[in-house]
Interface confidence: low
């Protein structure tokens, strides 16, 4: 059509210049378009140089939109993580502070001469919470054994108990010198800390996945399709035509096919995180136990003082008469030791509020990956509000007829807009799917009260989570899988935990 040859390119010139490109690239009037490599080759206002500049620009715009979405999601997850993580750390810090304030007056030198043992216990609990690969049951057992040894020496300074130590250690389980406190703390702490740390870790892994997926480059085929979607209408001389909705969805479903494959495991992870929050409440819940460690320690020392005479008699009976230390003072106590009655502090409602907010956010972001194409089309791609004869269909102004593809890589086999090789999934995204699976399995294990090792997350992620857990007093002690002296470095520890902190050499 000769008339179209003389059509002015002023509108395109204005748009092109606004993007910061040189106006000298733009022809005054339409030219023949055989040189075009992406846009339809009719009469056009775009030179090769313009087409490439706009292709670059459209890709950068999509990448920028993707990064914006990712950053917003990461910010949401980080807010939840920091709020809940800070709360759990504060509970443990408050427990230790209460112990440091109350124990000296109540227990005298039974506490003051053993502050190191108590401080070390809290340090280990802190490490464990933050993801260190240590065995909590063994850590607690070591603490009680060490404490018993030291307190026995203090209670019987006139004896020479060194010969006794082996015997005392062997008798400890039968004698139960600290009453029920060690067993109760072991059962409750393992489940509480596992629940708390796995939830916070889950938020960390989710955020990490989003960050890594945001770094996946768009395929060249996608770049062509995005250019065609966003700017070929300008080159074609219909700059006012906005992309047809279904056309935009097909382009972005093709471009983000690999990302949509995260959907199933992403949902599984978020479901497991919502579920684990059940373990935060009640007398054996994370809040009560982590904030009440000092209560069980006080119970233990109270029990030891109550049982002191019976205990000594039983030890003599089991281990023989001890030698007397001629330089040692008698069993009289240097300072009066009292009993300490501590109440668990009532919940402030802070955690309930934090968890309620986190659960709402987790539900909101469940369909993030599959809704991404639609969201970007609506919010970033200037998509036409309706599919009609006036929208841009990639070739001209007119209705877009192809059907909308399903979600994910496999469904793109016949995508008319983006050539997607469905036999070549993106390896970064496959790795992130595996990370989601591994974390979900940990959360399922944690729900059953299992002490989950936070090892290198490159394991195969297999194994099934247990069911609904078991009441505190019916869960038996597990056999240690690894000695607490062979602790591995962490790759997925909680924020702030360095590799050195995650290791402990024997």
């Amino acid at each position: 059509d000769p008339a179209s040859k003389s059509r002015s390119c002023s509108e395109v010139r204005q748009i092109y210049g606004a993007k910061g490109f040189s106006l000298s690239d733009v022809p005054q009037a339409e030219i023949s378009g055989e040189h075009l490599r992406i846009c339809p080759q009719g009469y056009t206002c775009c030179t090769s140089e313009m087409e490439e500049n706009l292709a670059n620009h459209s890709r950068m715009e999509l990448e920028s939109a993707l990064h914006d979405s990712s950053r917003a999601l990461q910010a949401t997850l980080a807010t939840q993580l920091h709020g809940i993580d800070d709360h759990f750390q504060r509970l443990l810090n408050d427990s230790e502070r209460t112990l440091q304030e109350a124990f000296p007056g109540a227990f005298g030198d039974l506490y003051t001469q053993n502050t190191r043992a108590f401080r070390d216990l809290y340090a280990e609990l802190r490490l464990y919470y933050r993801g260190a690969n240590l065995h909590l049951e063994e850590t607690l057992a070591e603490f009680w054994a060490r404490l018993l040894e030291r307190l026995f020496k203090q209670l019987h300074p006139q004896l020479l108990p060194d010969d006794y130590l082996d015997c005392l250690g062997k008798q400890a389980e039968a004698l139960r010198p600290f009453g029920d406190a060690p067993r109760e703390l072991r059962l409750r702490a393992t489940r509480a800390f596992v629940a708390a740390r796995s939830f916070v870790q889950g938020l960390g892994v989710a955020s990490d996945v989003v960050r890594k997926v945001a770094q996946v480059p768009l395929a060249p085929e996608c770049s062509r399709a995005i250019m065609k979607l966003v700017y070929c209408a300008h080159c074609r001389g219909v700059p006012g035509a906005r992309p047809c909705p279904d056309y935009c969805r097909n382009v972005l479903k093709g471009c983000l096919a690999n990302q949509a494959d995260l959907d199933a495991e992403w949902r599984n992870l978020l479901d497991s995180m919502v579920l684990i929050t059940d373990k935060f409440w009640g007398p054996s819940g994370a809040e009560s136990v982590i904030g009440g460690v000092h209560v069980w320690l006080a119970e233990a020392i109270n029990a030891l003082q109550d049982n002191k005479d019976t205990l000594t008699a039983k030890v003599i009976q089991a281990c023989g008469n001890p030698k007397v230390n001629p330089h040692g003072s008698g069993p009289e106590e240097k300072r009066r030791r009292g009993k300490l009655a501590l109440q668990e502090k009532p919940s402030t409602g802070t955690l309930e509020k934090l968890v309620s907010e986190a659960k709402a956010q987790l539900r909101d972001i469940q369909d993030f990956w599959i809704s991404l194409p639609g969201t970007l089309c609506s919010e970033k791609m200037a998509m036409s509000p309706a599919s009609d004869d006036r929208c841009w269909n990639g070739i001209s102004k007119g209705r877009y007829l192809p059907e909308v593809m399903g979600d994910g890589l496999a469904n793109q086999i016949n995508n008319p807009e983006v050539e997607v090789d469905i036999t070549k999934p993106d390896m970064t995204i496959r790795q992130q799917i595996m990370q989601l699976k591994i974390m979900t399995n940990r959360l399922r294990g944690a729900y059953g009260g299992n002490d989950v090792d936070f090892q290198d997350a490159s394991d195969d992620g297999s194994g099934s989570g247990s069911g609904g857990g078991c009441p505190d007093d019916t869960c038996g002690r597990r056999v240690s899988k690894k000695s607490s002296s062979s602790r591995t470095p962490l790759t997925h520890a909680l924020p702030g935990l360095s590799e050195q902190e995650g290791q402990k050499t024997s």
Epitope: R37, S48, E52, N56, R59, E63, P217, P220, T423, K424
Partner: antibody
Framework: AVTLDESGGGLQTPGGALSLVCKAS????????MGWVRQAPGKGLEFVAS????????AYGSAVKGRATISRDNRQSTLRLQLNNLRAEDTGTYYC???????????????????WGHGTEVTVS | VALTQPASVSANPGETVKITCSGS????????YGWYQQKSPGSAPVTVI????KRPSDIPSRFSGSTSGSTATLTITGVQAEDEAVYFC???????????FGAGTTLTV
């Protein structure tokens, strides 16, 4: 005129590390992707690494991935290649090369080279 | 993914020479190619075509580039003795997400 001057080559020991520097002049350095291409004696050209104009995107050839780090200083107009754990097969001439434009994530860098340095020889022995 | 080039091509002065470069396998990735001339081993390459069809200002107009699908062609119209060299094509390897070069074609005039 565009000039690219490589330095840092020479005799290197296996297992050691190499640091090559390319000093650029004659063009607005910060606007262009840059990279390194090498050539073993008697062999063809091999892509080593590329970096986008602002330094945010990098790409590495499969033979050096995990051992190489490409970086740039736009104020000094310098390009750097750090190559660790050197092997005999890293021997060759290393060329610094300028790209006409970094299209997107530099994925097509090897198709857009419009200027080359004279090269610096590296021998790992 | 590999870029396939003929090992050698020969021509008489004044003839038109075409050197091809094809992306193999299920390669549908890049649609940009560059052509680089190396006159002797160890001498620096010279770009004759970049970005499929762009020619640096100091390269004679007898050099041109074109593409069709995943195949690029370097055409030298009216080849001259000084064009004798090894010609490498360069493109993109999607599997490794990085640059890739063909093995080179020796042009004998």
């Amino acid at each position: 005129a565009v000039t690219l001057d490589e330095s840092g080559g020479g005799l290197q020991t296996p297992g050691g590390a190499l640091s090559l520097v390319c000093k650029a002049s004659g063009f607005t350095y910060s606007s262009y992707a840059m990279g390194w291409v090498r050539q073993a004696p008697g062999k063809g050209l091999e892509f080593v690494a590329s970096i986008s104009s602002d330094g945010s995107d990098t790409a590495y050839g499969s033979a050096v991935k995990g051992r190489a780090t490409i970086s740039r200083d736009n104020r000094q107009s310098t390009l750097r290649l750090q190559l660790n754990n050197l092997r005999a097969e890293d021997t060759g001439t290393y060329y610094c090369a300028k790209s006409y434009r970094c299209s997107w994530n530099c994925w097509d860098y090897a198709a857009k080279i419009d200027a080359w340095g004279h090269g610096t020889e590296v021998t790992v022995s | 993914v590999a870029l396939t080039q003929p090992a050698s091509v020969s021509a008489n002065p004044g003839e038109t020479v075409k050197i091809t470069c094809s992306g193999s396998g299920s390669y549908t990735g890049s649609y940009y190619y560059g052509w680089y001339q190396q006159k002797s081993p160890g001498s620096a390459p010279v770009t004759v075509i970049y970005n499929n069809n762009k020619r640096p200002s100091d390269i004679p107009s007898r050099f041109s580039g074109s593409t069709s699908g995943s195949t690029a062609t370097l055409t030298i119209t009216g080849v001259q003795a000084e064009d004798e060299a090894v010609y490498f094509c360069g493109s993109y390897d999607r599997s490794s997400d990085s640059g890739i070069f063909g093995a080179g074609t020796t042009l004998t005039v």
